[in-house]
Structures are given as C-alpha cells and as structure tokens.
C-alpha cells in the first residue's frame, strides 16, 4: 500500500481467482483513543472499533472510503483504491491502446518546436467517475523539472457503437535548451482513477522524436507567363523555432488530381518556393519536416490549382 | 578549415557535408519505433558518447560570441563516432552488405573532422570505450543505439553549420 495523495491510498493486488489479497491497517488521524468506530462509504454498518482497523483487501467491494467516527462526528477519511496486477502485468483497462507507432501505446505526445513545450493525449471509452493527474520530468535518476497543466477533455468521437473521449495535457520543460542535443529523455507519468480502480501509464521520449511542425503558412500560387507551370510559395509556420537559419525545415510539395487514384507528383525542397505543373482540378499541397532529423511531417497545407 | 586560435571554418563546405551526414545516418538506421532501445540492456555502452550540451556554445548566440568552443565539441564527437563506426561493432553478424550507408557515413565523419581540424593541430579527443560484443544480438543493439545517437548529434552539427554558413561566413 502507498499514498497517492493526502488520505488516498493505493493497494496493489495480485489479481487471480481466490487470491489472498493484502492485509491493510488503517489508522484514524485523531488524538482520540477511545470510542472510535469505522464505516465504509455510505453504509452505517460498523466494521470495527478502535484507533486502527485491520482489513483484508481482496476485491473492489473492499475498496472505498473508510471513515472513522466518534459520537456521530467524523474524525478522518482514508480512500482505498485498487491497482490490479494480472499475470505480473499491471492492468490497463482505463485507457485505450492507440497501437501507433507500436502496440501498447496509451499516451501519445507531440511538440510543435524545440522550446520544451509538448502536448500529450490519450483515449478512453469511460465517460464518468474519471480523474487524471500528470507528472513529468527530464530524466528519472536526477530528474529536472517539467511543469504540466491539468488534463482536460479535448475531443469526443463516435466509434461504431462506442463513444471515445480524448484527454490532453500541455507540459513545459522548466529550463529548456532548444539547441542542445538531448541526452536524457522526458518522462511522462499519468495517474488514472476510475471509480475505485487506479492505473498508471508512462511514456518516455526525446523532444526531437516527437517533433511535428505545424503546416506551412501563406501558401500561394503565382502562374508563370505562357506556361502551365505555377510558382508555389509558402512560409515557415509561426510556431516553429527561430532563427530559421538554425532550425531549418525541409518541404514536400505535392500535386494531387481530384481522383485519389491519379498519380501524385512530388517535389522535395529546402526552399520556400517551388515550380510545379498545375493540372486542371488538381490541388497543390505542402508539408514540412525538420531538415536534419527525420521526425514527423506536418499536416498538409493545400490550395486548389484553379 | 578551422584554424587553431579561432579563424573560421569553411562554413559552406561543412554545411554540405553535415547535411549529407544527416541523410546517411537516417539511411543507415531509418527505423524510429521498431524497438525502444532505451528499454533494452547495455545502458553503459552509449552513455559515454559525447553530447552537444547546453553550455557548449552551439546555440545561435554562442556561435556569434565564439564558435570555437562549439566546433571543438563537434570535432570531438565526429572523431568518437568515426572510431565507433570503424570498430568491430559494425563488422561481423548481423552482416552488413557492401552497399550499406555505414561505410559512407564512416568516410564522411572523417571528412568533416578533417575540414574542422587541419593537419598538425590537435584538439583533445575523447577515449572511446572498448566495446566488443560477442553476440549478434548485443552487436545489433549497439549498432542501433550508436546510429540513433549519431542521428541526434549530426542534426545539431548540421544546424550549427547551416547557421554559420548563413550568418558567419565571410
């Protein structure tokens, strides 16, 4: 058993049929010694008396809010949550496996630049009685500070018969050094509590590996005289790190016909303009990627050829 | 060339070669998520690689003030990785084909380090740990870790030379 926060405790249980469970001793936070009784949740049934209560925690029915009273007055509470371990593996019932970039990916994180700011998100099908708390650091043995906000519900989607809820959190490294080569990964830890079930999820990454620039901005076409060619131009996204002579991007320009089956013409360039042939009913799209490190491409910015 | 005492390197040549190094490093190990190398054993093996850290003056301001600190750090790293890529970690099983980018990567690391340091002048270099993994499994893991680490190192070096070529070239 360990303390998650004040008056909230997590009991770690090996979860299998007829498991013996864990013996837990609760102590009433009071100077009083006599006349103390214990109840669980809303029930008025007295579970025991005395300053301490010893219970065998085996299942969710044994978890909940234990309260010690004296003469009708509440002295203190202890909320017990369960953390299940099945076949040596901690349960992951609360969050959905996003399966990208690999199986058992519950948390996904992205950064728009090298400032040390990043966003993580996760999915669940649970809609109520759900709380999250997020902690983060750079490195684990001698951790350096990363400050995370509160997790918020950022999107709801319908997937078949189920509703899916996306939660996200923003974090900022306290003393970021955008130009340095990271040697210690960022660690993100999410505590999830659904009713009386506790689970924790972790992710470890370098900012450089989760970079995904915003799409290029101000995408414009300039027709070239007496030609089917056009000059496409664009600018670095506002959110990208500066100076651009140091934090450089590379770009992919694509000409795509109306039909998905039509052959795509692609050009790669380090410049912020390119000359392409504009076909009727086609569109021109541009996306960006860090020039020197192959992290994710941005989403496409697009304009119609006409 | 970077001349001892602080004259400028051939920024544009260094920029071109460092960008080529980036491309080669990703060709040699293009995978990002195929296995989490930080979860695997052998932590000590790549802990000793030289990293370009915050105080090394490789940020735009540091380069403007005095690029020599940064260039020395980059040179140190290039020599370190050049020795690693030439070691028996990259020979033996799993077999690398003769078209492997590792050969070109090795030669380009040497080329850039020579651009930074002319003959007859020696910046101190870092000792490379003696690593002779006997099992294919250990050797492959070590290759992947070295190449992932090299990708990060050459990305910073390429930024430095691109910025230098754009803002510090005579």
């Amino acid at each position: 058993i360990w303390e998650l926060k004040k008056d909230v405790y997590v009991v770690e249980l090996d979860w299998y049929p007829d498991a013996p469970g864990e013996m837990v001793v609760l102590t009433c936070d009071t100077p009083e010694e006599d006349g103390i009784t214990w109840t669980l949740d809303q029930s008025s049934e007295v579970l025991g008396s005395g300053k301490t209560l010893t219970i065998q925690v085996k299942e969710f029915g044994d978890a909940g809010q234990y309260t010690c009273h004296k003469g009708g007055e509440v002295l203190s509470h202890s909320l017990l949550l369960l953390h299940k371990k099945e076949d040596g593996i901690w349960s992951t019932d609360i969050l959905k496996d996003q399966k990208e970039p690999k199986n058992k990916t519950f948390l996904r994180c992205e950064a728009k630049n090298y400032s040390g700011r990043f966003t993580c998100w996760w999915l669940t099908t649970i809609s109520t009685d759900l709380t999250f708390s997020v902690k983060s650091s750079r490195g684990s043995s001698d951790p350096q500070g990363v400050t995370c906000g509160a997790a918020t519900l950022s999107a709801e989607r319908v997937r078949g018969d189920n509703k899916e809820y996306e939660y996200s959190v923003e974090c900022q490294e306290d003393s970021a050094c955008p130009a340095a080569e990271e040697s210690l990964p960022i660690e993100v830890m999410v505590d999830a509590v659904h009713k009386l079930k506790y689970e924790n999820y972790t992710s470890s990454f370098f900012i450089r590996d989760i970079i995904k620039p915003d799409p290029p901005k101000n995408l414009q076409l300039k027709p070239l005289k007496n030609s089917r060619q056009v000059e496409v131009s664009w600018e670095y996204p506002d959110t990208w790190s500066t100076p651009h002579s140091y934090f450089s991007l590379t770009f992919c320009v694509q000409v795509q016909g109306k039909s998905k089956r039509e052959k795509k013409d692609r050009v790669f360039t380090d410049k912020t303009s390119a000359t392409v042939i504009c076909r009727k009913n086609a569109s021109i799209s541009v996306r960006a990627q860090d020039r020197y490190y192959s992290s994710s491409w941005s989403e496409w910015a697009s304009v119609p050829c006409s | 060339r970077a001349v001892p005492g602080g004259s400028s390197p051939a920024w544009t040549q260094c920029q071109q070669l460092s960008q080529k190094l980036c491309t080669l490093a990703w060709s040699a190990h293009p995978l990002v998520g195929h296995m989490d190398l930080r979860e695997e054993g052998d932590e000590e093996t790549t802990n000793d690689v030289p990293h370009i850290q915050c105080g090394d003056g490789c940020d735009p301001q540091g380069l403007r003030d005095n690029s020599q600190f940064c260039l020395q750090r980059i040179h140190q790293g290039l020599i370190f990785y050049e020795k690693l890529l030439g070691s028996d970690i990259f020979t033996g099983e799993p077999s690398l084909l003769p078209d492997s980018p590792v050969g070109q990567l090795h030669a380009s690391l040497l080329g850039l380090s020579q651009l930074l340091q002319p003959e007859g002048h020696h910046w101190e270099t870092q000792q490379i740990p003696s690593l002779s993994p006997s099992q294919p499994w250990q050797r492959l893991l070590l290759r992947f870790k070295i190449l992932r680490s090299l990708q990060a190192f050459v990305a910073v070096a390429a930024r430095v030379f691109a910025h230098g070529a754009a803002t510090l070239s005579p």
Partner: antibody
C-alpha cells in the same frame, strides 16, 4: 519507382547453360546490391548470391559456387545470373531482388521471376 | 549455415481466427528476421523485417515478434485474402537462409 524486369522463361537441356537477366530502373544502379534467389517447384526459397555493381564484386552461397556466375552491366543497368552444367534439380523459378537501403539483406523489391526448366 | 525451421508446414483456419506461424533459428540471429507472403503464382512480398517492424502498407493484423532464435508471425484476424505461403528469412549471417514455408488455407 523501383522496378526489376527479368528475362523470359527458358527450357534447357541437361549439361547446358542459361543466362537470366534482370533490368533495374527507378534508382541508381550502382548504389545497391542485386541478389538472386531460386524457388524449386513447391519448395522454399534459396539465396544464391549477389553482385554489387559499383565494384563488380559478387558474393556467392558456397552451395552454388562453380554452378553460378553473377555479373552486372552498368551501361544498361542490368544484372545477370548464369547457371552452368544444368541438371534437372536446377529446375526452378529464379528471382532477382534488391534489399533495403540500410544495408541489411531483407528484400523489398523483387523481379517477376524467370522459370528455368531443365529437361531432356 | 543457419537453419530456419518453420512450423507448421501447412494450416487451415477460419476467417476471423488468430493464426500463428513460428520459426526457429539454429543459432542467434538477433532480430535479423523477415517474413514474406507469397500468393499462388506471385512474387514474395515483404511483410515484416527486424522481427517485428511492419513494412509500409502491410495491414495491422500482421505482427511479428521474437529475438535471437525464436520468432513468430501472427495474423490477429484471418481474412480471405491472406491465403498464401509464408516464409521466414534470416539475414544475419551468410548464406542468408529461408524457412521451408507455411501454406495457409481457409477452412
């Protein structure tokens, strides 16, 4: 895009030779090794060897040494595999293939295969 | 030479079934193992490399696992179009070798 186009099916007499070609396009021919595999009817695959066109250096599976010669013609971006002293056991589909760019021999692009039948 | 012992040599399963094919290398090949799918009369097609990395465009129902000597190809939910021969392949050591193949059919 990368393409490997092989020569057509051949029927040969025991003791004779056959030369199968593999024309490459869509990439720089001298940049990558070209490998040859064979698959006897209803059987698995066997790796025969490769040629690295940049320096014309072949490498063979010991089991095929003396039986196979692999060459390359840079001017036409074509690799060749010649089988000599043919026997009925050499009846198989022969494939050329090129591996991943990272320098490890897993095969991404394959020719369409050439059936060589050895029969008297 | 490294032997790649593949099993079963053939198997029949129903649409939607989870199918597992295994390959055992005669010595350590790290994770230098690929899996190929070959449909009747067609060319082998790369599915998995580095034991567990799916090649571009390969459906997520295909997954690979294992290291050193024991490797597995799994199809999580068999589809009619998965009828084919499947081969494992080690590219750790010369001469590169292949498993003898598994013929997969639909019941």
């Amino acid at each position: 895009q990368v393409q490997l186009v092989q020569s057509g099916a051949e029927v040969k007499k025991p003791g004779s030779s056959v030369k199968v070609s593999c024309k490459a396009s869509g990439y720089t021919f001298t940049d990558q090794t070209i490998h040859w595999m064979r698959q006897a009817p209803g059987q698995g695959l066997e790796w025969i060897g490769y040629i690295y066109p940049r320096d014309d250096s072949p490498k063979y599976n010991e089991n095929f040494k003396g039986k196979v010669t692999i060459t390359a013609d840079k001017s036409t971006s074509t690799a060749y595999m010649e089988l000599s002293s043919l026997r009925s056991e050499d009846t198989a589909v022969y494939y050329c293939a090129i591996p991943d760019r990272s320098g490890y021999a897993f095969f991404i692009y394959w020719g369409q295969g050439t059936l060589v039948t050895v029969s008297s | 030479d490294i032997q790649m012992t593949q099993s079963p040599s053939s198997l029949s399963a129903s649409v939607g079934d989870r199918v597992t094919i295994t390959c055992k290398a005669s010595r350590d090949v790290a994770i230098a193992v690929a899996w190929y799918q070959q449909k009747p009369g067609k060319v082998p097609k790369l599915l998995i490399y580095w034991a567990s990395t799916r090649h571009t465009g390969v459906p997520s129902r295909f997954s690979g696992s294992g290291s050193r000597t024991d490797f597995t190809l799994t199809i999580s939910s068999l589809q009619p179009e998965d009828v084919a021969d499947y081969f494992c392949h080690q590219y750790s050591s010369y001469p590169f070798t292949f498993g003898s193949g598994t013929k997969l059919e639909i019941k």
